[in-house]
């Protein structure tokens, strides 16, 4: 056949569906690739064609729309499975064409098995609830279009393996699950099972999501820079390694981008002609407050470097803050005779070194570090 605009395999839409459940899959062409919808395409005389390549095969096959009880069917721009089977797993292609136009895209469909407690390889969406914030709800996701509004399905909610009934602060209300007040103990996987009739058959839709209780916006503050601070002076001799940690606390904020960066003499480190390394580590509290540590490192510091201004900056949706580190060139200690008071000078040197080292390693008392070099 003639040339076709091929959008390739759209791995961004890795669709996962449960075995032995209905699945309705919209052709991604109209959602993400073309500027017109199915109705427009259809009225313009374009035809939508579906085919597939089964798992571990590279042979394109037509989809069998003549299976008993119309197990697989096409309706407008939707491919229906009533229900899915494990061996429906594969790459599906929808192609829109007429004699002069052709466009197609493929996408992976994975049919997955679940156990009796709803555990499966399915990637779960995460729903965040604010801690101690008042009534909040989650809604059973992705069930639109499976049955008409005239059909009244039964919905059962589970936390993990347990049916939710007589829970203190969690109340099932049809498609919604209400949390009267959310606590850390409410973290976990929640499953809704929607059961509905269709043409004398009963179908089940299973949807699981992860609830994560996070810091409340009521308690949110602008970023707090713990280090550098006014109590620590970074005194170094030329040739030594300079290590300055910037440790910042961020309150959890929904959809906020937390940023930490250093400037040296008002410029980004990349724009300064010195050999600077910055290592970042991130840790989270149970309510997803975040502590970011960026350690600025100059392996062999020069006397010019010790005169520069080193400023740590932090920004979140709550505001922007900055703090300068106090950096000095160490004055060489006077030489003492053995009989002289050298002992105390030596102790002071060790104390100074320990103090600076402790502050340089300031980020390391945080747990679960992920180092990004």
């Amino acid at each position: 056949s003639e040339r076709c605009d091929d959008w390739g395999l759209d791995t961004m839409r890795q669709i996962q569906v449960f075995e032995d459940e209905p699945a309705r899959i919209k052709c991604p062409l109209f959602e993400h690739f073309l500027k017109f919808n199915y109705s427009t395409a259809h009225s313009a005389g374009l035809t939508l064609i579906w085919y597939w390549t089964r798992q571990d095969r590279d042979l394109e096959e037509p989809i069998n729309f003549r299976l008993p009880e119309n197990r697989i069917s096409k309706e407008k721009d939707v491919l229906w499975f009533r229900p899915t089977l494990l061996n429906d797993t594969g790459n599906y292609t929808c192609m829109l064409r007429n004699t002069t136009y052709c466009s197609k895209v493929a996408f992976p469909l994975e049919v997955v098995q679940k156990d009796s407690c709803f555990n499966s390889p399915m990637k779960l969406p995460v729903h965040k609830l604010y801690i101690e914030y008042g009534i909040q709800r989650i809604t059973c996701p992705n069930v639109d279009g499976y049955f008409p509004s005239s059909v009244k399905p039964t919905i059962t909610w589970y936390m993990g393996c347990y049916k939710i009934q007589n829970f203190n602060n969690v109340i099932p209300e049809g498609m919604n699950l209400s949390f009267l007040i959310a606590f850390i103990s409410n973290n976990g996987n929640y499953t809704c099972v929607v059961t509905y009739p269709e043409n004398g058959r009963t179908f089940h839709l299973t949807r699981t999501l992860t609830v994560k209780v996070v810091g409340s916006p009521k308690n949110a503050v602008p970023p707090v820079i713990h280090s550098p601070n006014d109590h620590v002076v970074y005194e170094k001799e030329p040739g030594e390694e300079l290590l300055i940690p910037c440790t910042v606390y961020f309150s959890f904020l929904m959809d906020s981008r937390n940023e930490v960066w250093w400037t040296i003499d008002g410029k980004k480190p990349d724009d300064i002609p010195i050999d600077v390394t910055i290592n970042e580590s991130i840790s989270h509290s149970r309510t997803e407050d975040e502590t970011r540590t960026q350690i600025l490192s100059i392996k062999k510091v020069t006397s010019e470097d010790l005169k520069r201004s080193y400023v740590c900056h932090a920004r979140s949706a709550k505001g922007e803050v900055a703090k300068a580190a106090t950096v000095k060139q160490k004055v060489p200690a006077p030489r003492y005779t053995v009989e002289g008071g050298g002992g105390t000078g030596g102790l002071n040197d060790i104390f100074e070194a320990q103090k600076i080292e402790w502050h340089e390693g300031g980020g390391h008392h945080h747990h679960h570090h992920h180092h990004h070099h």
């Epitope: 056949s1 003639e2 035809t47 064609i49 042979l59 096959e61 037509p62 729309f65 003549r66 052709c102």
Partner: antibody, heavy 119, light 107 residues
Framework: QVQLVQSGAEVKKPGSSVKVSCKAS????????ISWVRQAPGQGLEWMGG????????FYAQKFQGRVTITADESTSTAYMELSSLRSEDTAVYYC????????????WGQGTLVTVSS | EIVMTQSPATLSVSPGERATLSCRAS??????LAWYQQKPGQAPRLLIY???TRATGIPARFSGSGSGTEFTLTISSLQSEDFAVYYC?????????FGQGTKVEIK
């Protein structure tokens, strides 16, 4: 009455290509699947691939993938099967046959086209 | 792909006798099986589809049975025009596959 009329016999050299046509009459063409089946001398039937002209997408058996091209021209109700890189083992009678869908029986057959590959 | 195996390869039967041809699929094809008759120099002709439904114009002496993996074509009383090669074909799974054929010859 549905009729499938195929093009005449061909003699081809190894390495060349052959294109066989199949013209349908007496019934709807576009919405049905046209398959190509071949039969080597004294051998059984071997399904090669098929197309629904209205859809314009052809599907092939693994064995012929990359070497066979099946097309259809709705305006003339004609389907075509082109086989490239011919070898002596491709000597066979090539049949076109119609079915109501890809997952259906072959209810009407063409008379067959003998393709001989010989140097 | 599904492998279709026919037996016997050749069946020698006297006119008027009953002929039973067998076809086995390597995995279930449900009832999506067809039988074809082919005479020398002719194209195949559809006899049975859906494992047991006779095609238009096929005499009642031809009958098909079976489902899943085991299928049978029975010719209740062989006529002279029935001596031919018979093929089974599955159309349940892509790609379609044929059996190697059973030749019914005059005993």
């Amino acid at each position: 009455q549905v009729q499938l009329v195929q093009s005449g016999a061909e003699v081809k050299k190894p390495g060349s290509s052959v294109k066989v046509s199949c013209k349908a009459s007496g019934g709807p063409f576009s919405q049905h699947a046209i398959s190509w089946v071949r039969q080597a001398p004294g051998q059984g039937l071997e399904w090669m691939g098929g197309i629904i002209p209205f859809e314009g997408v052809a599907f092939y058996a693994q064995k012929f993938q990359g070497r066979v091209t099946i097309t259809a021209d709705e305006s003339t109700s004609t389907a075509y099967m082109e086989l490239s890189s011919l070898r002596s083992e491709d000597t066979a009678v090539y049949y076109c046959a119609r079915s109501s869908s890809y997952y259906s029986w072959l209810d009407y057959w063409g008379q067959g086209t003998l393709v001989t590959v010989s140097s | 792909e599904i492998v279709m195996t026919q037996s016997p390869a050749t069946l020698s039967v006297s006119p008027g006798e009953r002929a039973t041809l067998s076809c086995r699929a390597s995995q279930s094809v449900s009832s999506n099986l067809a039988w074809y008759q082919q005479k020398p120099g002719q194209a195949p002709r559809l006899l049975i589809y859906g494992a047991s439904t006779r095609a238009t114009g096929i005499p009642a002496r031809f009958s098909g049975s079976g489902s899943g993996t085991e299928f049978t074509l029975t010719i209740s009383s062989l006529q002279s025009e029935d001596f031919a090669v018979y093929y089974c074909q599955q159309y349940n799974n892509w790609p379609w596959t044929f059996g190697q054929g059973t030749k019914v010859e005059i005993k």
